[in-house]
């Protein structure tokens, strides 16, 4: 059965997946897909790496961890209810039927609505200014709430703050970290 992860509408979702490369930078291709892992590849691919870097992506999907050291956890920005479902993380180890497959279930909950303390709503508090920040691709924007502009060097730190570390630990405890080589 899939491990379950939760996020709120408008927040970033974090789906952990790890492996240990034989040597840092000696990567195994990885794909992430929407839907359970099929026999081969990933269905409905949202992100893929080759032996060096991300070579296929869709705009809200990021590898914010140090994927060259095996942290291929997926961050989905600004989730909607439509992002609910099963995601496949597939570590494409060379050789026949060697792939490691992990199915992760993402449950998106509606955003919590906090009632306004007075009749005259403070729109700045209720709807913080949404700023775009630069991500891992030229001019692709990612919405990370009311934050100052950040660049690539800050994305990783931000991702660490956003993720639920307990979930990452749960996944590690469930044995979803594999060693290559």
């Amino acid at each position: 059965s899939e491990v379950e992860y939760r996020a709120e509408v408008g927040q970033n979702a974090y789906l952990p997946c790890f492996y240990t490369p034989a040597a840092p930078g000696n990567l195994v291709p990885v794909c992430w897909g929407k839907g359970a892992c099929p026999v081969f590849e990933c269905g409905n691919v949202v992100l893929r790496t080759d032996e060096r870097d991300v070579n296929y992506w869709t705009s809200r999907y990021w590898l914010n961890g140090d994927f060259r050291k095996g942290d291929v956890s997926l961050t989905i920005e600004n989730v909607t209810l439509a992002d609910s479902g099963i995601y496949c993380c597939r570590i494409q180890i060379p050789g026949i039927m060697n792939d490691e497959k992990f199915n992760l279930k993402l449950v998106i909950k509606p955003a919590k609505v906090t009632p306004a303390p007075t009749r005259q709503r403070d729109f700045t508090a209720a709807f913080p200014r949404m700023l775009t920040t630069r991500g891992h691709g030229p001019a692709e924007t990612q919405t990370l709430g009311s934050l100052p502009d950040i660049n690539l060097t800050q994305i990783s730190t931000l991702a660490n703050e956003l993720r639920d570390s307990r979930l990452a630990n749960d996944l590690r405890d469930s044995g979803a970290t594999i060693r290559i080589g």
């Epitope: 991300v54 070579n55 869709t58 891992h136 691709g137 001019a139 692709e140």
Partner: antibody
Framework: DVQLQESGPDLVKPSQSLSLTCTVT?????????WHWIRQFPGNKLEWMGY???????NYNPSLKSRISITRDTSKNQFFLQLNSVTTEDTATYYC???????????WGQGTLVTVSA | DIVMTQSQKFMSTSVGDRVSVTCKAS??????VAWYQQKPGQSPKTLIY???YRYSGVPDRFTGSGSGTDFTLTISNVQSEDLAEYFC??????????FGTGTKLELK
Amino acid sequence: DVQLQESGPDLVKPSQSLSLTCTVTGYSITSGYSWHWIRQFPGNKLEWMGYIYFSGSTNYNPSLKSRISITRDTSKNQFFLQLNSVTTEDTATYYCARGYRSAWFAYWGQGTLVTVSA
Amino acid sequence: DIVMTQSQKFMSTSVGDRVSVTCKASQNVGTNVAWYQQKPGQSPKTLIYSASYRYSGVPDRFTGSGSGTDFTLTISNVQSEDLAEYFCQQYNSYPLVTFGTGTKLELK
């Protein structure tokens, strides 16, 4: 193996448009990666001009934004550069290249020298 | 724009030497730096990406290091075929990736 090959006129008159083609073999430009134009001026300074993603979206160097367009023909596995209103300052060797999401370049074409002169 | 400065336009070396080509970014670019080698009449070739990862097929005498604003490409045991121009590139800031001004490696 992936190969990129630039083609187009080697001489363009000032105020005209420069049009170049990059033909990619060994990989479909719709299957992944980003597909870039980079130029190198006399004296060897390199300038990134813009890209078209495998998905078809584009982005350009702000210094060229009003003059540049990058398009593609997926049936021929080609992508194109058009630079309008050229001046002698646009004389350069033009390269097409394949990049990653993070925009470093693993494969480059051999380059084509374009001279802008009356 | 982030400016990548290669302060030495030319560097003289001898076969068998160890040489370090430096590149300084005008602001923090993390490890989002690549190095390219270009020989006369040829297109640039990728040597290093993500500051320290050697591209496939690149001899291990080429080493990249650094993070933040200071980066170094070290060539140990220089060979005659290494005489070329070397460029750094940052890809931390978008939409603009920028290149260094280049350092030409010559024989003493």
